[in-house]
């Protein structure tokens, strides 16, 4: 986990002081989940929960580059759409998945076509 | 599963080069670190340095600065070690290995140089 | 650069015993550690990686651990075709390093 500071930013949790300075969010047990985030405003210090999403530090870091396909059809039932990921490069040490599947709401526009796709179909 | 086929190791007079090859099939060639280590005789491993098909990133052990190049050429799978001015100590069996760190490396057989007058 | 020692040297035991081969680097390099086995006249094969982590094909009595500056490879009963070289290698920093090697032979 990177140790630079996150840029200023403005009133901290509860506090009167008008800038902190935020610290990266820091795992409490291996490198993803739920862990803490260190604040400092003058002398004083602060430390507020936060999470690191699993499958975004491992996969979607810059540990790990993907090539991805185009996105597919939208899906009428889960009004979603998918694209699958072949991976282009690790960092030495990254253990990134081969391939990932990322999926995306559809816009309302692709989810309307679909669902009248779905409603021609069954006529 | 990836396979790497080595080539082009033999004899060569002091001073001379030599360029060797490491063919990759099976798995994605482009997607994984290629390593080059060498070891001489009754001694043990020794790294020369790695190369990125995908972008030809290349991170070298300082020692072969000036005596190790290394390439890819995508369109045919296959990753270069070039050395130059070679000496009786570069004898060596010099190795390819497709590292990923997400299911382990594949090595080549190894092609022996031997520099020699 | 990493130095790494391993120890010992050449160990001598027979086929059903327990091997204990030690790796120090001079430096922390967290789980970034590698154990190899080498056999005369082949090319290295990974045993263990990331201190601990088993690889795929490699029998279960082979296992590691770490991390830090001190790991261990463990041959929980040796059987004959184990005997060979061993090797340590990190990949924590430039440039990769390997250990001196321990020779693993028949008592």
């Known amino acids: 986990v990177a140790k630079k500071k996150d840029k200023v930013k403005k009133g901290g949790p509860g506090s009167e002081c008008a800038e902190w300075a935020w610290g990266p969010c820091t795992p409490s047990s291996k490198d993803c989940g739920v862990g803490f985030r260190e604040g400092t405003c003058g002398a004083q210090t602060q430390r507020i929960r936060c999470r690191v999403p699993c499958n975004w530090k491992k996969e979607f870091g810059a540990d790990c580059k993907y090539k991805f396909e185009n996105w597919g059809a939208c899906d009428g039932g889960t009004g979603t759409k998918v694209r699958q990921g072949t991976l282009k490069k690790a960092r030495y040490n990254a253990q990134c998945q081969e391939t990932i599947r990322v999926t995306k709401p559809c816009t309302p526009k692709t989810k309307a076509k679909a669902k009248a796709k779905k409603g021609k179909g069954k006529d | 599963q990836v396979q790497l086929v080595q080539s082009g190791g033999g004899l060569v007079q002091p001073g001379g080069s030599l360029r060797l090859s490491c063919a990759a099939s099976?798995?994605?060639?482009?997607?994984?670190?290629m390593n080059w280590v060498r070891q001489a005789p009754g001694q043990g491993l020794e790294w020369i340095g790695m190369?990125?098909?995908?972008?030809?990133?290349?991170i070298l052990n300082q020692k072969f600065k000036d005596k190790a190049t290394l390439t890819v050429d995508i369109s045919k799978n296959t990753a270069y070690l070039q050395m130059n001015s070679l000496r009786a100590e570069d004898t060596a069996v010099y190795y390819c290995?497709?590292?990923?760190?997400?299911?382990?490396?594949?090595w080549g057989q190894g092609t022996l140089v031997t520099v020699s007058s | 650069d990493i130095v790494l020692t391993q120890s010992p040297a050449t160990l001598s035991l027979s086929p059903g015993e327990r091997a204990t081969l030690s790796c120090r680097a001079s430096?922390?390099?967290?789980?970034?550690l590698h154990w190899y086995q080498q056999k005369p006249g082949q090319a290295p094969r990974l045993l263990i990686y990331?201190?601990?982590q088993s690889i795929s094909g490699i029998p279960a009595r082979f296992s590691g651990s770490g991390p830090g500056t001190d790991f261990t490879l463990t041959i929980s009963s040796l059987e004959p075709e184990d005997f060979a070289v061993y090797y340590c290698?990190?990949?924590?920093?430039?440039?990769?390093?390997f250990g001196g090697g321990t020779k693993l032979e028949i008592k």
């Open positions: 290995s497709s590292w990923s760190a997400k299911r382990g490396d594949f």
């Open positions: 099976g798995q994605s060639f482009s997607s994984y670190w």
């Open positions: 190369i990125h098909p995908s972008d030809s990133e290349t």
């Open positions: 430096e922390s390099i967290s789980n970034n």
């Open positions: 990331y201190a601990s």
């Open positions: 290698q990190q990949s924590n920093s430039w440039p990769l390093t």
